[in-house]
Structures are given as structure tokens and as C-alpha cells.
């Protein structure tokens, strides 16, 4: 009975999400393997988040709006481990918008989800950021490593979206 009611709840939750995400990829987790954590297909998952790499070239604002329509934001990177996971799926000759911007050009960087900007947990390439006119951040491969660079927000780039996992 308990299992039956849990399955019914899951199915109704899945139906609820199906109007937003036609397909979900779920894995069982939790100490009794009773919880399912899901990401939209074909998003990838790491820890408690889902990630989507958009190869559509768009401005930073349009990229953020695009993520938002999918229930996500441009990616907020909190740890080196998270960045290392993300970069496994990136092309080394491309650049991707992050959810990091400095709209006034005052070098007051801010994350799209209001996570406090911590200078100690940043991965800027050497010499970056370097221009008050370049108010949006990308991640790209330079000098044999992945890092961040400030760029013009209006210049179209690829992007990375991030959302919380869906638990059912």
C-alpha cells in the first residue's frame, strides 16, 4: 500500500513536470534508494544540479532569457569540482556564457541567482577581467586550462544553463 501510494504520487508529479519537460532522466538515490532525482533529457547531472550546453550563439541577455524559459539560469559555478565537471562536455575552441555579469562596469560582479560573488572562488584567466566595457563572463580554454574571461555582453556566444534537480 505504501509503495503503491508512493508510485501514484510519483506518476502525478511526473505528469505535472511533463508539460515543461517532455522527457526526464531519473536515478534512484537516498539511503533507502527510495528517492528519484531527475534532470530533463538530454541535460547532464552533477551533485544536486542539472546542466544544459546551448550551442545557439546569442547575446548574454538572450542566453539568460533562454535558460529562464527552461526553468533554469545561466550557470553559477560554486566550486572547482563543479567547473571540472562542466568543462568535460565543452569544446576547447568555443566560449560559453556564465551567469556572471557586471552591468554597471564598476567591477561589481554578480551571479544571476544572487549567490554572493566570492573573489576567493573565482577562476579568471590570468590578467582577467580586464575591461570595464566587457561586462559579461564566459568560460573558455586558454593557456592549457579552462578559465573565465570578461567579454562584451552583446556579442553572441554559446552558453550553459543550470537548474536544480527535480526530486520525485
Amino acid at each position: 500500500n505504501f509503495m503503491y501510494s508512493k508510485t501514484v504520487k510519483r506518476l502525478s508529479k511526473l505528469q505535472e513536470y511533463q508539460q515543461y519537460y517532455p522527457s526526464l532522466t531519473c536515478v534512484m538515490e537516498g539511503k533507502d534508494m527510495e528517492d528519484w532525482s531527475c534532470c530533463p533529457t538530454p541535460w547532464t547531472s552533477f551533485q544536486s544540479s542539472c546542466y544544459f550546453i546551448s550551442t545557439v550563439m546569442q547575446s548574454w541577455t538572450k542566453s539568460q532569457n533562454n535558460c529562464s524559459v527552461m526553468g533554469a539560469d545561466l550557470v553559477v559555478i560554486n566550486t572547482k569540482e563543479e567547473q571540472d565537471f562542466i568543462t568535460q562536455n565543452l569544446k576547447i575552441n568555443s566560449a560559453y556564457f556564465l551567469g556572471l555579469s557586471d552591468p554597471k562596469g564598476w567591477r561589481h560582479w554578480q551571479w544571476v541567482d544572487q549567490t554572493p560573488y566570492n573573489k576567493n572562488v573565482t577562476f579568471w584567466h590570468s590578467g582577467e577581467p580586464n575591461s570595464p566595457d566587457e561586462r559579461c563572463a564566459i568560460i573558455n580554454f586558454r593557456s592549457e586550462e579552462w578559465g573565465w574571461n570578461d567579454v562584451h555582453c552583446h556579442v553572441p556566444q554559446k552558453s550553459i544553463c543550470k537548474m536544480k534537480k527535480i526530486y520525485i
Epitope: Q58, S59, W60, T61, K62, Q64, N65, S101, P103, K104, G105, N130, S131, P132, D133, E134, R135, C136, V151, H152, C153, H154, V155, P156
Partner: antibody, heavy 121, light 111 residues
Framework: EVQLVESGGGLVKPGGSLRLSCAAS????????MSWVRQAPGKGLEWVAT????????YYPDSVKGRFTISRDNAKNSLYLQMNSLRAEDTAVYYC??????????????WGQGTTVTVSS | DIVLTQSPASLAVSPGQRATITCRAS??????????MHWYQQKPGQPPKLLIY???NLESGVPARFSGSGSETDFTLTINPVEAEDTANYYC?????????FGGGTKVEIK
């Protein structure tokens, strides 16, 4: 006082080349992105090329891509537009304009008086 | 590319009256309260001159009879009251995304 003075325009045959210059004064040229904007006779404004302050970024519309090259010499406070394989439809007044960034975009806050390019056989 | 459509293409206004020009973008040029639409005036034989930036901000030295409003895709430039010296072409321009694009222009004549 901010001043932008274009030169180098003239009459050229189709397929020919021309190099436009824009001399900037009255501001720290190296700190600003710059653009070329053109206006065909009796027509509206059409953006032609952009270069970032540090020369790291250039951008062109499809109509001139591969034919026009924007460049700058910050030591000389000068902006250039090299125009090759010119066509009749490139006939226009060419303005150089300074970009001022605002939030996620920019606007053109100062314009030169323009230089006229005529492409005709 | 973002297409900007200005209307009307031309208008004639009597001195002291109000002139209203609209600019419609093919997609939003706004983001979180910032509207990246700008307005320029071009008098015959002269280069364009910045009037309004970011939809509603009056450029320094521009008379207060010029004002701008709007958001997302619909923007308006208003001249009130119109003076004889306002005879010119007026252009809108967006900068939220490359390439920067201009509207086709509106010719304002004073009756």
C-alpha cells in the same frame, strides 16, 4: 571637446579599394570601442563595423564581411576602415562613431562629420 | 538580427504641438528593467546626434522638450512642444545584441 574627423573618401571604380581614417581628439581614445556607420544617399543609417577598445574584438555585417577591415592605432588616436572589392551599393557617407557602454549594451554618443565614398565606373 | 520598424515614415507638425514617433522591435530589447533602445536626430547635411539613451535618459545638452519612453518591443520619442529647429530625421537604434540595428527613420517637418 570630443572631436572625430574622417578622411579618405573619394571616387573609386567597382572592385577598387579605399582606406578611410578617423582622427580622434578630446578624449582617451584607447578606452572606447569605435564603429563605422554609413548612410547611402537619401537612405537611413547602416552599421558597418565595430572594434573594441583593446582591439580584441571586431564585428561586421554580412554585407561587408570579408571585404572591409576595421582597425585602430591607439598610439595615433586613429581609427581605420580598409574597404576592398568595392561595389556600387557601398556608395555612402561613412561616419565614425564613439561607443559608450550602458548596462549590457551601448550607444553612439559622438559622431564625426562623415566622408563620402562614391563607387562608380 | 533585430528589426526596428519606425512609424510614421514622416509627419508634419505645427509649432507648439506634440510630435510622437514610435519604434517597434522584432523582439525584446529590455532586460531586468534596462531598455537598450536609443534615439538620434539628424538634420540635413549633418551627422546624427544622440538625443535619448536607454529609452528615457536625456543626453546632456538636449532640450527637455524631447522625451522617450517604452519597454520590451515598443518605444516612443515625443517632442513637446515642437519648435521650428526640430525639422530633422529621427532614428531609433538597439544595442542589446549584435549587430546593432537602426530603424528606417522618421522625417519630421514643421508646418
Amino acid at each position: 571637446e570630443v572631436q572625430l574627423v574622417e578622411s579618405g573618401g573619394g571616387l573609386v571604380k567597382p572592385g577598387g579599394s579605399l582606406r578611410l581614417s578617423c582622427a580622434a581628439s578630446g578624449f582617451t581614445f584607447s578606452s572606447y570601442g569605435m564603429s563605422w556607420v554609413r548612410q547611402a544617399p537619401g537612405k537611413g543609417l547602416e552599421w558597418v563595423a565595430t572594434i573594441s577598445s583593446g582591439d580584441s574584438y571586431t564585428y561586421y555585417p554580412d554585407s561587408v564581411k570579408g571585404r572591409f577591415t576595421i582597425s585602430r592605432d591607439n598610439a595615433k588616436n586613429s581609427l581605420y576602415l580598409q574597404m576592398n572589392s568595392l561595389r556600387a551599393e557601398d556608395t555612402a557617407v561613412y561616419y565614425c562613431a564613439r561607443q559608450l557602454y550602458y548596462s549590457y549594451g551601448y550607444y553612439f554618443d559622438y559622431w564625426g562629420q562623415g566622408t563620402t565614398v562614391t563607387v562608380s565606373s | 538580427d533585430i528589426v526596428l520598424t519606425q512609424s510614421p515614415a514622416s509627419l508634419a507638425v505645427s509649432p507648439g504641438q506634440r510630435a510622437t514617433i514610435t519604434c517597434r522591435a522584432s523582439e525584446s530589447v529590455s532586460f531586468h528593467g534596462t531598455h537598450l533602445m536609443h534615439w538620434y536626430q539628424q538634420k540635413p547635411g549633418q551627422p546624427p546626434k544622440l538625443l535619448i539613451y536607454a529609452a528615457s535618459n536625456l543626453e546632456s545638452g538636449v532640450p527637455a522638450r524631447f522625451s522617450g519612453s517604452g519597454s520590451e518591443t515598443d518605444f516612443t520619442l515625443t517632442i513637446n512642444p515642437v519648435e521650428a529647429e526640430d525639422t530633422a530625421n529621427y532614428y531609433c537604434q538597439q544595442s542589446i545584441e549584435d549587430p546593432p540595428t537602426f530603424g528606417g527613420g522618421t522625417k519630421v517637418e514643421i508646418k
